[in-house]
Structure formats: C-alpha cells, structure tokens
C-alpha cells in the first residue's frame, strides 16, 4: 500500500506528545522533502 501524508502527520503528532510526556523530550518538527509529481504512481490507496 501507499502512505498518505495525513496519516504520517497524525502519527508523528501522537509520537511527539508521547515523547514529551513520557521521556521529557521535545521534538520541534520534521522536514518533509519536496517531491516531484509521481507519474509512476499506480491505482489504489
């Protein structure tokens, strides 16, 4: 399957909250690389 940017962002935010509460870690943000249009993409989610 493929990965949706929405799902990644939601999961990341969950981990960020957990890191702060359980380990006293602060994650500021992640860098999302600029991507070209996926002309080779296939059908399906």
């Amino acid at each position: 399957g493929t990965i949706n940017v929405h799902d990644v962002e939601t999961q990341f935010n969950q981990y960020k909250t957990e890191a702060a509460s359980r380990y006293n870690l602060t994650i500021s943000d992640v860098s999302v690389s600029d991507v070209p249009f996926p002309f080779s993409a296939q059908s399906g989610a």
């Epitope: 990965i3 399906g44 989610a45």
Partner: antibody
Framework: EVKLEESGGDLVKPGGSLKLSCVVS????????MSWVRQTPGKRLEWVAT????????YYPDSVKGRFTISRDNAKNTLYLQMSSLKSEDTAMYHC???????????????WGQGTSVTVSS | DIVITQTTAIMSASPGEEVTLTCSAT?????IHWFQQRPGTSPKLWIY???NLASGVPVRFSGSGYGTSYSLTISRMEAEDAATYYC?????????FGSGTKLEIK
C-alpha cells in the same frame, strides 16, 4: 477547515497580462503541491499548472508554457499565477486546487477554490 | 497527449436505478480521478485513484477500470446525485480531463 480563495481575475485585452492569487488556510501549505485549473465558458476543465510543495518542481501543458508562470510564497500561504501574452482562448474561470500527492501516490485535487474570472477580449 | 473521452454528454436515470458513467483514454493510464460538479459550484473530488471514495461520498458510488477503460457506478440513483461528472488522468503530462457527463434525474 480547508479554504482556498482566488483573486485577481479581470477583463483584459489580448496580449495583456494578469496575476492571479490564491490565499489558503486550514492546512500546512508547504506540504502540498498546488495547481491551477480553468473552466471554460463551455464548461470544459483544463489543467493550467502544478507546483510542488517547496516550489522545486513545476509543470505546465504546452498551451500555456512560456506565457504563464506558477509560483508560491509558503510564508504567506499564497499561490500565484502570472499570465502574459493572453489570448481569447484563455477566457475562463480559474480555480486553485490543493494536490494530495506524494512520492509514490496521487490522491487527486482534493480541495478547490471558488475561482476567479478572467475574460480576454478587445 | 492522452485524450479522455466521456462519450455520453447527457444521461438521465430514475430514482433507485443503477447508473454507470464511462470514461476512455486514447492510451493506457494507471488510474483516473472523478470529480462531481453541481451547478454554480466548483468541482469536487469524488473518486480518487480509480476506486477510492473521497471524504463524504456516499457508499452507493464506486469506481473501477484499468488501462484505457474506466467507469463510475451509482448503485441506486438519488436526486442529490444529479450533477456533471468529469474524469481526469494524471498518469502523464499534460493532465487531461474528459468533457463531462451531465447526469439528470427523471
């Protein structure tokens, strides 16, 4: 709530220029590609341009290449379309759209603005 | 350029009827997207990547196809489904749209 709001449409003479803007809100602008799509008076949809989230990758159909320039200002959450050497066939409603694609998937133009009207006529 | 053809410009269906809209491409594409447009509004993404329903789209809609032939099916037509439906290919540049099928309710 995702919002896209276009502006800048006008009546312009053939050969003239116009710059359209699209201000967005409700999502992290820099993480999404954006496109311009126009709808002609005959209701046909025509793709005009696409730009990647960081602005590195830009695509145009031959019909506008060399005349139109798509750009974005991620600090201002704004997409632009600079149009020059306008022709009567450029007359249309211009919509900006959010593009939900990534390195190996394309989930389509998932949000559209209401559009701004461009009329090219002498 | 890949030309997308929606051969039926206008079609009508009775409430509860099954409806199939078709879309064909001049050469093989990996997937297509479908958009719905009601009068006076902007197009809305309706089905993406051939068979995936966009957010809020009723489950009576489905999409299928491969290669050069694709379709959108409504299992039971409802009044709110009356609209114009456009298909689009983005397998190769330039991205192209079909001319649309206007679906009316009888």
């Amino acid at each position: 709530e995702v919002k896209l709001e276009e502006s800048g449409g006008d009546l312009v003479k053939p050969g003239g220029s116009l710059k359209l803007s699209c201000v967005v809100s409700g999502f992290t602008f820099s993480r999404y590609g954006m496109s311009w799509v126009r709808q002609t008076p005959g209701k046909r949809l025509e793709w005009v341009a696409t730009i990647s989230g960081g602005g590195t990758y830009i695509y145009y159909p031959d019909s506008v290449k060399g005349r139109f320039t798509i750009s974005r200002d991620n600090a201002k959450n704004t997409l632009y379309l600079q149009m020059s050497s306008l022709k009567s066939e450029d007359t249309a409603m211009y919509h900006c759209t959010r593009d939900n694609y990534g390195r190996n998937y394309d989930y389509g133009m998932d949000y559209w603005g209401q559009g701004t009207s461009v009329t090219v006529s002498s | 350029d890949i030309v997308i053809t929606q051969t039926t410009a206008i079609m009508s269906a009775s409430p509860g009827e099954e409806v199939t809209l078709t879309c064909s491409a001049t050469s093989s594409v990996s997937y297509i997207h479908w958009f719905q447009q009601r009068p006076g509004t902007s197009p809305k993404l309706w089905i993406y990547s051939t068979s995936n329903l966009a957010s809020g789209v009723p489950v009576r809609f489905s999409g299928s196809g491969y290669g050069t032939s694709y379709s959108l099916t409504i299992s039971r037509m409802e009044a709110e489904d009356a609209a114009t439906y456009y298909c689009q290919q983005r397998s190769s540049s330039p991205f192209t749209f079909g001319s649309g099928t206007k679906l009316e309710i009888k």
